[in-house]
């Protein structure tokens, strides 16, 4: 149930995340399942555990196997399994199916190819992109952050795309490659009246004065590429940019996250150094498209101060 497949190539870095949810303050213990041997946390080891992450720097074929992670949260220990397979490097250009990440589809309007698993690594731009082993060149291809954008997508753009980047760990560099297929399709979607998944209507969000707080506005708009769809936050009915409080900023999440084929958008409202006056504001999560506008209101309430009595 809580098992995740991970794979990589020998002599490349591989970082695997525990498939169970954790928190920064909760320790995570990692074990090699076959022997129940604990994975060390010291970074001098080639394979070591670092909280939620298990790092192979670099990976070896012999590292293949099942690894157990246990999130030591209070009340319940959450156990997960990482099924790791390390393959020998292929001498030819062909990328076998077992090394491929999920296929992504694009259209003329939407042609982003995300580099799989890159968020687990400490990398710096630019990414290198290859199609069928050839380095991509030309103005139609733009490597932007962790994804590749292809302008004026054509059916000939379908194929296997490999991203290559360098992971840095304590000054040492390790190469990582990841490949996924890209297919081009005619967009046949539909749009619906926006559905806000979070926050709940009239939700009360508890915050601590002086700490940072995040509110996520998440909504879905239909299937396929949306002609017009937006999520945004308002404060007391005013756009964030017009409100003029530099401590409160909104930040776009992943542009279109297709879960269950739905086109969804996220917008995170970040409040730095929460102040008493922030509790008096009305926070509106707005989702709009051609069908109309939906609004969910959130208010902040003071998380009770941590009074220590001894």
């Amino acid at each position: 149930k809580f098992s995740k497949q991970s794979w990589g190539l020998e002599n490349e870095a591989l970082i695997v995340r525990c498939p169970r949810q954790g928190k920064p303050s909760y320790t995570v213990d990692w074990y090699y399942s076959q022997t129940n041997k604990s994975i060390p946390t010291q970074e001098r080891n080639r394979v070591f555990a670092s909280g939620q992450l298990l790092k192979f720097l670099p990976a070896a074929v012999a590292d293949s196997g099942i690894y157990t992670c246990i999130v030591r949260s209070p009340t319940f220990n959450r156990t997960g399994y990482a099924n790791v397979t390390i393959y020998k490097k292929q001498s030819d250009c062909n990328v076998p199916d077992y090394l491929m990440y999920s296929t992504v589809s694009g259209s003329e309007k939407n042609s982003k190819i995300y580099c799989p698993t890159i968020d687990l690594y400490n990398w710096t731009a630019p990414l290198e992109w290859f199609k069928n082993c050839q380095a991509l060149q030309g103005s139609r291809y733009r490597a932007h952050k962790s994804f590749l954008v292809i302008d004026n997508v054509m059916t000939e753009d379908a194929g296997d795309y490999t991203c290559k980047f360098i992971h840095n760990e304590n000054g040492a560099n390790y190469s990582v490659t990841a490949t996924r297929s890209f297919t081009v399709k005619d967009e046949q979607g539909f749009s619906l009246f926006p559905v806000i998944g979070a926050p709940a209507q009239n939700e009360i969000k508890e915050v601590e004065i002086g700490k940072n707080a995040n509110l996520t506005c998440s909504a879905c708009f239909g299937k396929g590429t949306q002609f017009l769809a937006a999520v945004l936050w308002q404060l007391n009915g005013t756009k964030i940019t017009d409100f003029g409080e530099p401590r409160i900023q909104q930040e776009e999440g992943q542009n279109q996250s297709f879960s269950n084929g739905l086109a969804c958008l996220d917008m995170v409202l970040r409040i730095a150094d929460v102040k008493e006056e922030d509790l008096l504001l009305q926070y509106d999560c707005l989702a709009l498209n051609l069908h109309g506008l939906r609004r969910h209101t959130v208010r902040l309430s003071r998380k009770n101060p941590i009074d220590h009595h001894s």
């Epitope: 169970r20 009340t75 319940f76 709940a200 939700e203 941590i306």
Partner: antibody, heavy 123, light 111 residues
Framework: EVQLVESGGGLVQPGGSLRLSCAAS????????MHWVRQATGKGLEWVSS???????YYSGSVKGRFTISRENARNSLYLQMNSLRAGDTAVYYC?????????????????WGQGTTVTVSS | NIVMTQTPLSLSVTPGQPASISCKSS???????????LFWYLQKPGQPPQLLIY???NRFSGVPDRFSGSGSGTDFTLKISRVEAEDVGVYYC????????FGPGTKVEIK
């Protein structure tokens, strides 16, 4: 307003079944672990079962194999399917909210409780 | 299983006077994250329990400052500095380090 409302309690014969429901509102249900706690008349509180945000389930020894906890995040609902009921299961059953996994900060224990629903097992 | 014990099991207090309830756990409630998972609840007659104190000594929102919690490891105390009529009910300590266990409860009544 943060609220939990239980339903589904009633009178049932030993060996019978009941399904309790808990409707949550006013908070993002999917990010919280949820729990059932019961209290027999004039007695103390007893933890019964829990379900975490990822669907993993936990049971006290006295109900393991007979009770099944589940959740439906899309409906903001928590359930407790109770089979092979015994007289000793007679109690008020409370639905209660636990840890918020969207908040890296403090854990408030069981901070929100419903009013409870009464289950009576008797022939 | 962690066992929780409370003393006294009942307490009769004059309004305005202090009250103290002790709670002991069969093992330390200190977690590897540095926090201690001990909570205090008040259950008023005919009502569900309500959270008073979390993490040994932190008052939950809306809880009057006459309530205070202290202790560490396995020994904990809830104090009411000046008992009021509305404080009657059963007080429970609870651990959530390993699953959940409640103490047997302390019934507080007004003299």
């Amino acid at each position: 307003e943060v609220q939990l409302v239980e339903s589904g309690g009633g009178l049932v014969q030993p060996g019978g079944s009941l399904r309790l429901s808990c409707a949550a509102s006013g908070f993002t249900f999917s990010t919280f672990d949820m729990h059932w706690v019961r209290q027999a008349t004039g007695k103390g509180l007893e933890w019964v079962s829990s379900i975490d945000t990822e669907g993993d389930t936990y049971y006290s020894g006295s109900v393991k194999g007979r009770f099944t906890i589940s959740r439906e995040n899309a409906r903001n609902s928590l359930y407790l399917q109770m089979n092979s009921l015994r007289a000793g299961d007679t109690a008020v059953y409370y639905c209660t909210r636990g840890e918020d996994w969207s908040d890296d900060d403090y854990y408030y224990g069981l901070d929100v409780w419903g009013q409870g629903t009464t289950v009576t097992v008797s022939s | 299983n962690i066992v929780m014990t409370q003393t006294p099991l009942s307490l009769s207090v004059t309004p305005g006077q202090p009250a103290s309830i002790s709670c002991k756990s069969s093992q330390s409630l200190l977690h590897s994250d540095g926090k201690t998972y001990l909570f205090w609840y008040l259950q008023k007659p005919g009502q569900p329990p309500q959270l008073l104190i979390y993490g040994v000594s932190n008052r939950f929102s809306g809880v009057p400052d006459r309530f205070s919690g202290s202790g560490s490891g396995t020994d904990f105390t809830l104090k009411i500095s000046r008992v009021e009529a509305e404080d009657v009910g059963v007080y429970y300590c609870m651990q959530s380090l390993q699953l959940f266990t409640f103490g047997p409860g302390t019934k507080v009544e007004i003299k």
